[in-house]
Each structure stands twice: as C-alpha cells, then as structure tokens.
C-alpha cells in the first residue's frame, strides 16, 4: 500500500474557492490535516509558494489530469495516493458550492476524506467511516474519526508520538509570591500559559491554583535555555521560540526539523541582534516583535514583515515605555511584562487598563 516515507509533510493551497473567505479555507484545511495528525506521528506545514507534498486546488472540468470534473453534484473531489509530483494532491470541483455549514457541500468533511486518500487510505465500505465513498453531512464541530479510520491510518503510520509529559502539578513555593520575579518570555500554549525563565518554565491553566515547573531540556532537548521571546499561533498548534539571532518552531509540542532558522529570514534588519518579546494577535493575524525601543509587525498570512516598520513603541503603544521583557496575548488583551510588573493593555482602545505584579497569574 502507498504511504509517505516521512513524518513531516508540506501542503499548499494553490488557489481558493470564491465560495468562502480565504481565511476560512485556510482554517478548514488546517483542521482537516489536524484530524489526521492527531492520530498519527504525521506533522503538516503549510507552504505559500513552491511545490508541496500535497497540493490542494479548486478547478472546473479539465484541470491537468485525466479525471475531469463533472459539474455540480456527482464527483465532488478526488485525490492521489502518496508520492512525488501529482501524487498526494487533492482536487476539489469548483462547480460545487463549498461551505462551512450543512448547506451546499461542507469543505471540511470532503477535505478530511480527500486528505485520507492523500495519505494512502482507500475507500471504506463502513458507512460510519469518513472514507466511505458517499458524502453525507456531519457536524464538523463534533466530528470524530471512526475506529476504522484510526485503525487504517495507524496501520500505515503508527500511533502518534506522545509529547513529553509535563511534570505533575505542584503549588508555588511559599517564597514565590514574595519575590520580585521577572520572566524571559510568556505565551499561551493551547489552554496553558508558559512562563519561561533561564533553563526552565512554569506552566499553569488560568484559573487553576496549581502551578507546574519543567526544565526546557526535559521536554525539548534540542531547545536551548534562556529563551528571550515566544508566541503561539493556536489555530495551527504552533509555538515559536526565540533566542539571539535564531528561532525554533514547536508543532503540536514537537520541535520541527530544519530549525533553528535565522531571524533575518523573517525580515529583520541586520541591526537586530535579539528579540526582547513577541506576541501573536489572532484578531489581526499579526505578530508584534519588540526590540529595544521599537517594534516590528509581521503578517502571518503573507509570511512577510509589514512595510514601514520598525516603529517606536512609545508612539504606537501609549503608556508603554521600553524595555519589554515579555508579552502575552490573553482574552483580547496584551499583558506586557517589565521586571516585577505587568501592564494589561487593550489594543482596541490603545491604552493601559491595569498594572499588576508579574506573579499575579500564580495567585499571588
């Protein structure tokens, strides 16, 4: 049977259906790939140019292979088994009305099915399987792979590699709240918040009294101590870590190969020797990088630094004075850490709304 002979795969959405917003299409495919990565060791990375392992396209009729689309209804899409070139690619009939709901044809459900083929799965004769050849609507928000699907995909790739377990909870030491504590970097990681300091990090669930501490090397042996900036793109399960002129990508808690990469590949000028803090704003789809008295803004959709940057922090973030240790995005606010204190900042109204101790997250 056909399967990919590597764990890390790339995909590219070559073109977009006009039926939906681009960001909805991006999100749907990210979630469709996640359905398969959740139950296997496979990891998927989106490319914006060049040839990817899995090319995704929307087309009418004849579109470069022998399998012409047939107009509305009938064949909704097709995909090729793993391999080079056209193999692994997934084609969607543009004559369908693609949606994210029960109306028209639900793109997520068809994408999960077609990507199953792209990963090497054949059709199933089990009507509960997503690989059953006939389309039927299921609620995407409650969608689960059938036991058959999981068994079949794991027969090709095995079960997921367990992320290293974080150490069991412990209460903060009694001295913790009495220290004037500063952090190197702070970011959400899924539902948790990670507070990096030297060679370790604290992590906790907001609202939970328990605090946990883990050394960086015990969970990610390839990541150095002294992380200086971090941010998460939660919709992609991606965590970015920065130290000096390098950055690392952690995907689903697993470090990606081919990292670290140079921060200059992101568009920083040569004068930038390290990033003090970074934060991803999901509403704007921008990353804000804080460097001394300035900040840079990076567009994650275009994978480009925005023009006309850097800009002065003090001018564009009223009430914020450099230098910044760390920034956290949480519930539509930025938490800007400076020494033993943090400023709660509302980016919508561009103002500081609270001043707190850095350790307020720990129930201090």
């Amino acid at each position: 049977r056909s399967r990919w002979m590597k764990r890390y795969l790339t995909y590219r959405i070559y073109n977009y259906t006009p039926d939906m917003k681009r960001e909805d299409v991006d999100y749907i495919f990210q979630k469709a790939f996640q359905v398969w990565s959740d139950v296997t060791p496979l990891r998927f990375r989106k490319l914006h140019k060049d040839e990817a392992d899995i090319m995704i396209l929307f087309a009418f009729g004849a579109h470069g292979d022998f399998n012409y689309f047939d107009g509305k209804g009938g064949t909704l899409a097709h995909a090729f088994y793993p391999g080079p070139g056209i193999q692994g690619d997934a084609h969607f009939d543009e004559a369908e009305t693609w949606t994210k709901s029960f109306q028209g044809t639900n793109l997520f459900l068809v994408a999960v099915h077609e990507l199953g083929h792209s990963l090497g799965l054949q059709h199933s004769n089990n009507p509960k399987s997503i690989m059953y050849p006939t389309y039927r609507y299921l609620n995407p928000s409650t969608f689960r792979l059938s036991a058959d699907d999981i068994r079949n995909i794991q027969s090709l790739y095995g079960a997921p590699v367990k992320p290293p377990s974080l150490t069991k909870p412990s209460s903060p030491p009694s001295t913790f709240c009495h220290q004037s504590l500063s952090f190197d970097a702070v970011t959400t990681v899924g539902e948790k918040i990670f507070f990096f300091k030297d060679w370790f990090f604290w992590w906790k669930l907001p609202g939970s009294p328990a605090t946990n501490i883990t050394s960086i090397s015990s969970i990610w042996p390839s990541i150095p101590s002294g992380i200086q900036a971090a941010y998460e793109i939660e919709s992609r399960n991606q965590l970015f870590l920065f130290k000096d002129e390098k950055y690392w990508l952690i995907n689903n808690l697993v470090p990606e190969p081919h990292y670290p990469r140079s921060i200059y590949s992101l568009g920083f000028s040569a004068s930038v020797k390290k990033v003090d803090a970074a934060v991803f704003d999901p509403l704007r789809q921008k990353v804000y990088f804080f460097v001394d008295k300035h900040y840079w803004r990076y567009d994650v959709r275009q994978e480009l630094m925005d023009p006309a940057y850097p800009k002065l922090i003090s001018t564009h973030f009223p009430g914020i004075k450099p230098k910044i240790d760390a920034v956290l995005y949480f519930k539509r606010h930025y938490y800007i850490f400076q020494g033993a204190y943090q400023l709660e900042y509302d980016p919508l109204f561009r103002r500081v709304t609270k001043t707190l101790k850095s350790t307020s997250w720990f129930g201090c």
Epitope: S2, Y14, H63, F66
Partner: antibody, heavy 122, light 103 residues
C-alpha cells in the same frame, strides 16, 4: 527493474483488426494505471487510451473512440489494445506506458516500452 | 479542451550552449506538466515531472520551471547526447515537439 514489452504489431489492411499486447514486469502491475501512446512516422506523440488498475475504468482519445478497446489481465501482468476498423491514419509505433498507482491517472508516463509498429495499408 | 503549444518547433545549437524550450497551455494546468526526451528510433524518456521535479537519473543540467499556463525546459550546457526531440505533456495532451539539432 521495470520492463514493458509490446508485441502484436504488423501490416493490416484498412478496416482490419489487430490486438496489441504489453507484457509488464518489475513492478506490481495491478496497482498501476496503464496507457497506450502512439507516434505516426515522422510525427509527434499522441495519447491513445488508458485503463485503471482494476480494469474498471477506461478512457480513449476521440480519434479512436468506438474502434479501440483497452483491457488488462492482472493475473498475467499484461495490457492489451484491441484495434478494429483500422484506418491508414492509425499507422504508427504504439507504445505502452506506465502511470502512477491508485484510482486516478495523472498521465505521468515514467516508463515506456520500446514500441511495436502497426502499418495500415492496402 | 486544454491545448498545449510548444515552441520553437526546431532549434539549432552548439555543445555548451544554454537552451530554453517553452510550452504554453490555453488554460491553467497548475504544475501538472511533464517533459520528455526522445531520440530517433527510441521510446520517449521522462525528464521532468510536475513542472520542475527532475526524474531520477536525469542529469542536473536539465531543469523545468513554470506554473499555470507558461512552462520552460532549460538545458544549462548542451552535451552531445542532448540532441533529440523534446515534448511537453499534460494528461492526454502532448506539445508538437521541439527538435534540437547541432548547429
């Protein structure tokens, strides 16, 4: 090593019939889409027909539709092209070519046979 | 239906020359274009698939580029064994061929 060997070509009169065979080895024949491509003397390449791995799906160029039939015998690792109602313009070297595996054909011909010459003349 | 237009139909060049052959589709074929080399009396051989991927065993002086409707095959430094006919192809459609001859 992948090998494709065509046979069955020859001289035939207009309106006559001929059956070409292509013996395949070096790969799991039943997993792959297979094609026939032809080349008239001194001319370019022209795709003729393809068949899916199980033989259930076939596709033909307009120029041969209704006259040619592609088939396969996976137990014998052999591809066939039954050519009826032959015309002078069917004179060509006929090549069999291997495509990618799976339910759909890409038309990526990664291995070709040496070809067999079919001459239609009175 | 999709049509492929290949140019030039013939080309004279010398050993060591850089040569470019182009292929144009009348509608987008994404990156689904292949290039073949055929020598007299022989079967065609796959050189480039998916517009830019080099088939195993093909010398690196051959390269392909393009996507959508416009594609090129480039031979960076012609060798004596490269004088042949070249075809672009997508699915059931071949270009008319480019005969590369010694100047």
């Amino acid at each position: 090593e992948v090998q494709l060997l065509e046979s069955g070509g020859g001289l035939v009169q207009p309106g006559g019939s001929l059956r070409l065979s292509c013996a395949a080895s070096g790969f799991t024949f039943s997993d792959y889409n297979m094609h026939w491509v032809r080349q008239a003397p001194g001319k370019g390449l022209e795709w003729v027909s393809y068949i899916g791995p199980s033989g259930g799906y076939t596709h033909y160029a307009d120029s041969v539709k209704g006259r040619f039939t592609i088939s396969r015998d996976n137990s014998k690792n052999t591809l066939y092209l039954q050519m009826n109602s032959l015309r002078a313009e069917d004179t060509a070297v006929y090549y069999c070519a291997k495509d990618i595996r799976g339910a759909y054909s890409s038309g990526l011909f990664d291995y070709w046979g040496r070809g067999t010459l079919v001459t239609v003349s009175s | 239906d999709i049509q492929m237009t290949q140019s030039p139909s013939s080309l004279s060049a010398s050993v060591g020359d850089r040569v470019t052959i182009t292929c144009r589709a009348n509608q987008s074929i994404y990156t689904y274009l292949n290039w073949y080399q055929q020598k007299p009396g022989k079967a065609p051989e796959l050189l480039i698939y998916a517009a830019s991927s080099l088939q195993s065993g093909v010398p690196s002086r051959f390269s392909g580029s393009g996507s959508g409707t416009d594609f090129t095959l480039t031979i960076s430094s012609l060798q004596p064994e490269d004088f042949a006919t070249y075809y672009c192809q997508q699915a059931g459609i071949f270009g008319q061929g480019t005969k590369l001859e010694i100047k």
